[in-house]
């Protein structure tokens, strides 16, 4: 039976039998917080072989191994994740093995074992063999492998029943437990699942299967299953649901949402059921089945119950996250904040239409209205006193409204209204009245001349770049002299620049009064030799990697009532010269036959150009005799138990210091210092930590239903 | 276990009605199409009709088209036909049948009831 | 409608033959094809799915293969409980029909 939409076993370990009849689970298994220990070796729940989401298991007191519960779960799909991760084993404090031993494939993400105290047998079991890159994989604070003293099936007997495979250059026995080992299929099936008689299963098969070569046969699906069977794609009239199996348009239809009662049911879309249209589409009409592409950003109508909505910080703007269509008036109050004009485009940066007004004052945080980068309309159905519907009073440091070369904003009623912005230059308003086709309506007093733009630098000279030259990580730029009407109002110059994919970056972006900028800045004083033109050199850049530069003089700006003339030039795009490639990732090589040798690779994270080809060399190595030399098995290996207390802490030295040469000369050797990289490491994976638990906590600690 | 346990069947006049019903257990009831199958004495199986696991959508033979009705009570886990102006031709002993898997209406039935018989006849 | 005609109509064994059952279909029905055993006075059970699936509980001398509009049901070792009545249903679209019976009787 396919159990779901998710099953969420706390606090009662009797709960555990609403898994008693599930083949599938169609969605997550939680087994989590149940603090009681108690004795489950009556619980055992063979039918269940698949589990479409992730498997989290967190503080299950008195659960020694998974492998008595779970004897035969073989695949989890991983088609949704608990942050990044499709199993997760945290925090289990009598978890001795994991003993999944019929696990097989985990498709999608990685796995997190953590803070396990007494957990062993982590080292034996070979996750490349389940997972298809274990780089993601995060397998900290548990028992210590040296106090585990993992034995595979037969080792002590000097009989071994199972195979070996390297992990990290050691060449070793894989298994779950001491009487089970890690199976493994015949090089000859490649990546196709196989019977417990070594038999090749079904290309569509995953995980295991009954009889060889059947696609009725299997455990679990490659792709899809439909109608007893694994398919390469669902049939006509079907359609893939939850990533795994194929569901008629009836099934679909009906389907009550998980999340909730009141949603408009599931949807038809690209031969997929699913809860939603995906982003860009939208319902063909209310009660439609089917999706339509959006014309533009999809339509988000919100209102606002007291007709005006205050955006006072990050939370309030938080609230409009998605909205294309806000009904009501916007009064924006913007006084401080961090990174504030990329937060609020995060926010507001969809919404398109107003249907009241625009009101934006005492707002000292903003440098421009561009995070409200697709306002095309401001409908004035409601207006301030005065028949204002954009109102612009008191902003400290506003310089820009919106970049009117790539903008156009209607103002369907009302009057604007601009007062006491003083970096907010007049001619920038005068534009606003054209595009807006507000010109005319507003009288004389509506648009202060005197007290807009007072300290701004209005009337802007355009810098040219004279030349410019890059190499793999610098470029150097060179620009006219600028010289003012009195050559003493100049200052100096500030070059601009921010890594730019595409060609399509203004000058305000991500910036805000409070000191946050997307752009890079560097002073560059005059050149004393007034013949010579100003130029800089950017080092430290990223190779084959397009920056956008700009450059403004810094002048004295006032010269009592006068507007002085300020400079500043037009954007410029300039792309790094290639250089070479990082080292290419994941790579991993198994032998297929006597005379071959697989080998694969993820491309490098930093390709520094355009990747056109790879070098692969190999060489033949002797057999290191060393691995026969010694029996790893022998009882004196084994080290005392000792427990773990499960917390992160760096291995402790248990044997005195080996004296070794160190510098040169003889004696005991301390251990060398971290080097800041390495502290920065540490630093970063106990920032990540937190971050997962914070994660955790939050997920599955929930208000008790009323 | 599973089970499927049919009742209402009996003997009626031409023209007249009888209402079958079908009794499940051991599985999850609205999760699965349900269907009724007929085999008249000494012939082969003929289906009659299928119904979704939900009841939104509902399938006919032709022959019976515009005279029964299938229909299903997932609360109570039940399942109905409706048989209306019935014919000397539709005595059979009609099975109700639960469809192999779960998510479409088209497919095989894995599970059958033991028949109750329907007989028309003046 | 999809026609399916099941060849023989009946047909005589012994216990320990292998009996070959054919059914084919009027048009392609891909492998959308079960076969079910019924004995007289009694359900009909499903034997194969999908042409050539084996419905659980079901013995493995019961095999089924063929797709498009050719299938056959083999039964190898013939048993005592093996004599009854076979049919073969499709799945590939509505209205659902049957074969019309192969009768298996005891030689």
């Known amino acids: 039976e396919i159990c779901g939409p998710g099953i969420d076993i706390r606090n009662d370990y009797q709960q555990l039998k609403r898994l008693e009849n599930c083949t599938v689970i169609e969605g997550y298994l939680h087994i989590l917080l149940i603090s009681k220990a108690e004795d489950y070796r009556s619980y055992r729940f063979p039918k269940l072989t698949v589990i479409t989401e992730y498997l989290l298991l967190f503080r299950v007191a008195g659960l020694e191994s998974l492998g008595d519960l779970f004897p035969n779960l073989t695949v989890i799909r991983g088609w949704k994740l608990f942050y990044n991760y499709a199993l997760v084993i945290f925090e289990m404090t009598n978890l001795k093995d994991i003993g999944l031993y019929n696990l097989r494939n985990i498709t999608r993400g990685a796995i997190r074992i953590e803070k396990n105290a007494d957990l062993c047998y982590l080292s034996t079991v070979d996750w490349s063999l389940i997972l298809d890159a274990v780089s993601n994989n995060y397998i900290v604070g548990n028992k210590p492998p040296k106090e585990c003293g993992d034995l595979c099936p037969g080792t002590m007997e000097e009989k071994p029943m199972c195979e070996k495979t390297t992990i990290n250059n050691e060449y070793n026995y894989r298994c779950w437990t001491t009487n089970r080992c890690q199976k493994m299929c015949p090089s000859t099936c490649g990546k196709r699942a196989c019977t417990e008689n070594n038999e090749c299963c079904h290309p569509e098969c995953l995980g295991s299967c009954s009889a060889p070569d059947n696609d009725t046969a299997c455990v679990a699906c490659r792709h899809y299953y439909y109608a007893g069977v694994c398919v390469p794609a669902c049939p006509p009239n079907t359609y893939r649901f939850e990533g795994w199996r194929c569901v008629d348009r009836d099934f679909c239809a009906n389907i009550l949402s998980a999340e909730s009662s009141d949603s408009e049911g599931f949807v038809i879309h690209d031969g997929e059921c699913m809860q939603e249209c995906p982003s860009g589409f939208i319902r063909n009409g209310s009660q439609s089945m089917y999706c339509i592409p959006c014309e533009g950003p999809c339509p988000k109508v919100c209102e606002e119950e007291k007709k005006t909505k205050t955006i006072d910080s990050v939370t309030s703007a938080q609230m409009l996250q998605g909205c294309t269509i806000f009904k009501g008036n916007l009064l924006i109050n913007i006084r401080r904040g961090n990174n504030i004009a990329s937060e609020l485009e995060n926010f507001m940066g969809l919404i398109e239409v107003v249907t009241g007004y625009v009101k934006i004052r005492h707002s000292h945080a903003l440098v421009s209205l561009s995070f409200l980068k697709n306002l095309r309309l401001i409908l004035g159905e409601e207006q301030l006193e005065g028949n204002y519907s954009f109102y612009v009073l008191d902003n400290q440091n506003l310089q820009q409204l919106w970049d009117w070369d790539h903008r156009n904003l209607t103002i369907k009623a009302g009057k604007m209204y601009f007062a006491f912005n003083p970096k907010l230059c007049v001619s920038e308003i005068y534009r606003m009245e054209e595009v807006t086709g507000t010109k005319g309506r507003q009288s004389k007093g509506d648009i202060n001349t005197r007290n807009n733009g007072e300290r701004a630098s209005c009337e802007s000279d355009v810098l040219h770049f004279t030349s410019t030259t890059t190499s793999k990580n610098r470029i150097i730029i060179t620009w006219h002299r600028y010289r003012p009407p009195d050559y003493r109002d100049l200052i100096s110059f500030t070059v601009y620049y921010k890594e730019a994919p595409f060609k399509n970056v203004t000058e305000y972006d991500g910036q805000d009064a409070c000191g946050s900028n997307s752009w890079n800045m560097v002073d560059v004083d005059l050149p004393p030799n007034k013949d010579v033109e100003p130029g800089i050199l950017l080092h430290g850049l990223k190779p084959w990697t397009q920056y956008a530069v700009y450059v403004k003089a810094v002048t004295l700006t006032m010269v009592e009532n006068d507007h002085i003339r300020g400079a500043k030039s037009e954007i410029l795009y300039i792309r790094t010269n290639a250089s070479v490639p990082s080292i290419p990732l994941d790579v991993l090589s198994a032998s297929n036959s006597s005379s071959q040798l697989i080998v694969k690779w993820n491309p490098p994270s930093l390709p520094n150009g355009n990747l056109s080809y790879y070098i692969v060399r190999w060489q033949r190595q002797p057999q290191d005799g060393y691995l026969y030399r010694h029996n790893y098995c022998s009882k004196d290996k084994i080290p005392i138990r000792k427990y773990a207390d499960g917390t992160i802490d760096i291995e402790e030295v248990t044997e005195n210091p080996k004296t070794e040469v160190c510098g040169g000369e003889k004696g005991p050797c301390c251990a060398c210092p971290k080097t800041e990289a390495e502290k920065q490491a540490e630093k970063e994976e106990a920032e990540y930590r937190k971050v997962f638990e914070n994660f955790l906590h939050n997920s599955i600690f929930v208000p008790r239903p009323e | 276990q599973v089970q499927l346990v049919e009742s209402g069947g009996g003997v009626v006049r031409p023209g007249g009605s009888l209402r079958l019903s079908c009794a499940a257990s051991?599985?999850?009831?609205?999760?699965?199409?349900m269907s009724w199958v007929r085999q008249a004495p000494g012939k082969g199986l003929e289906w009659v009709s299928t119904?979704?696991?939900?009841?939104?959508?509902?399938y006919y033979a032709d022959s019976v088209k515009g005279r029964f009705t299938i229909s299903r009570d997932n609360s109570k886990n039940t399942l109905y036909l409706q048989m209306n102006s019935l014919r000397a031709e539709d005595t059979a002993v009609y099975y109700c049948a639960k469809e192999r898997g779960s998510g479409w209406s088209l497919d095989n039935m894995d599970v059958w009831g033991q028949g109750t018989t329907v007989t028309v006849s003046s | 409608d999809i026609q399916l005609t099941q060849s023989p109509s009946s047909v005589s064994a012994s216990v320990g033959d292998r009996v070959t059952i054919t059914c084919r279909a009027s048009q392609g029905i891909s492998r959308w094809l079960a076969w079910y055993q019924q004995k007289p006075g009694k359900a009909p059970r499903l034997l194969i799915y999908?042409?050539?699936g084996l419905q659980s509980g079901v013995p493995s001398r019961f095999s089924g293969s063929g797709s498009g509009t050719d299938f056959t049901l083999t039964i190898s070792n013939l048993q005592p409980e093996d004599f009854a009545t076979y049919y073969c249903q499709q799945a590939s679209s509505f209205p659902i029909t049957f074969g019309q019976g192969t009768r298996l009787e005891t030689k």
């Open positions: 119904i979704s696991g939900s009841g939104g959508s509902t």
């Open positions: 051991g599985f999850t009831f609205s999760s699965y199409a």
């Open positions: 999908a042409a050539s």
